[in-house]
């Protein structure tokens, strides 16, 4: 894990803009784990950050991520019909100035250093799921979610016409 103490030093001043230049409605510092209780961890390797999905050893500290919640400012057409009310979007930052990004070309989830305003690739539609879980859908690619593949985070297409088991796109958020 890296630089996580830096997350604790975040202030609202660092998070005072979104796509439309407004503040997030709230923020939440949490550890991220899979439906099967594997931890999402972050490591610096060869001058770039890697994201892992792994079982932590007992008493090993979990990495924390700062979730910044935003209202979508207009009725969205994320669902393809343009009739939705407001939704919740989220950005995820495990350390100062770095955010999770959707790389739709490579179907990968990456950590990128960037300045405000954040690009659309850093925003995810937040889905409230049962079993105390959430899912993260790419703002830039409706129907594509952050998921787990081969002990890494990846982008996974969820097709409502297919009987997919979605445990691999379910995540738990925990303050501990």
């Amino acid at each position: 894990a890296f630089g996580i103490s830096g997350v604790q030093k975040y202030t609202r001043a660092l998070h005072d803009s979104s796509i439309t230049g407004i503040s997030p409605i709230t923020e939440y510092l949490a550890s991220l784990s899979t439906y099967n209780d594997q931890s999402i961890t972050f490591a610096l390797e060869d001058e770039s950050y890697e994201i892992y999905v792994e079982d932590l050893k007992k008493d090993e500290k979990k990495d924390k991520v700062l979730l910044s919640y935003y209202e979508s400012q207009h009725p969205s057409n994320e669902s393809g019909d343009g009739v939705d009310g407001k939704m919740l979007m989220v950005t995820l930052s495990p350390t100062k100035d770095f955010w999770l990004h959707a790389n739709n070309k490579e179907h990968s989830v990456e950590l990128h250093k960037c300045e405000k305003p954040l690009p659309d690739q850093a925003f995810f539609v937040l889905h409230n799921m049962h079993s105390n879980c959430v899912s993260f859908e790419c703002k830039t690619d409706p129907g594509v979610f952050i998921g787990v593949k081969d002990n890494h985070l990846a982008l996974i297409k969820v097709d409502s016409s297919e009987n997919l088991c979605t445990e691999n796109i379910l995540f738990k958020l925990s303050e501990t």
Epitope: A30, K86, H130, C165, L173
Partner: antibody
Framework: EVQLVESGGGLVQPGGSLRLSCAAS????????MNWVRQAPGKGLEWMAE??????????HYAESVKGRFTISRDNSKNTVYLQMNSLRAEDTAVYYC????????????WGQGTLVTVSS | DIVMTQSPDSLAVSLGERATINCRAS??????????LNWYQQKPGQPPKLLIF???SQGSGVPDRFSGSGSGTDFTLTISSLQAEDVAVYYC?????????FGQGTKVEIK
Amino acid sequence: EVQLVESGGGLVQPGGSLRLSCAASGFTFSNYWMNWVRQAPGKGLEWMAEITLKFNNYSTHYAESVKGRFTISRDNSKNTVYLQMNSLRAEDTAVYYCARRNYGNWYINVWGQGTLVTVSS
Amino acid sequence: DIVMTQSPDSLAVSLGERATINCRASESVDKFGLSFLNWYQQKPGQPPKLLIFVASSQGSGVPDRFSGSGSGTDFTLTISSLQAEDVAVYYCQQSKDIPYTFGQGTKVEIK
């Protein structure tokens, strides 16, 4: 136009059964969790049942008061959600609203006009 | 089950004045750093309409005079300047846990 239209309400005797239907139009029905909410005459709102999506294995959830008596189901090919009500009691008398949760499942943002179910002998 | 209790049961407010409705949950409705608390307005003979979600975010097309606040167990809906068309019953609802539960409703009338 986004619309939910309920049907199937009416007068039924205690112990009887009724099947409510809700026809959805104007949106991609298969993308949304659907709910039933009821309101007894002159009373408040009571959430009844919910059904999720195919990729959630159509999981269903119920209020304790109707668990084992009511069954929610959906037919995406017909854009319709159903509520099968068995062993009806006088206290089930209410207007039954079909309702759609928003994309992301945070709140209900589309409601039908409701259908009245009266349980009486 | 989480029990939602609203106060007052009814409220008479002069046009242009502020109306405040309180909602208390029997346990915290917070999760993921958000409050799973919605407010709905219901006018006679109509289905409910969403006003506020996650405690303080306005629904689409909701006038700015409606605002929500609170977290944990205590929440407030405020109508900053009551209009004639705001006469209705207002319900809070928690969506943190199944069964989703509503408050008993608060009837708002013109004084």
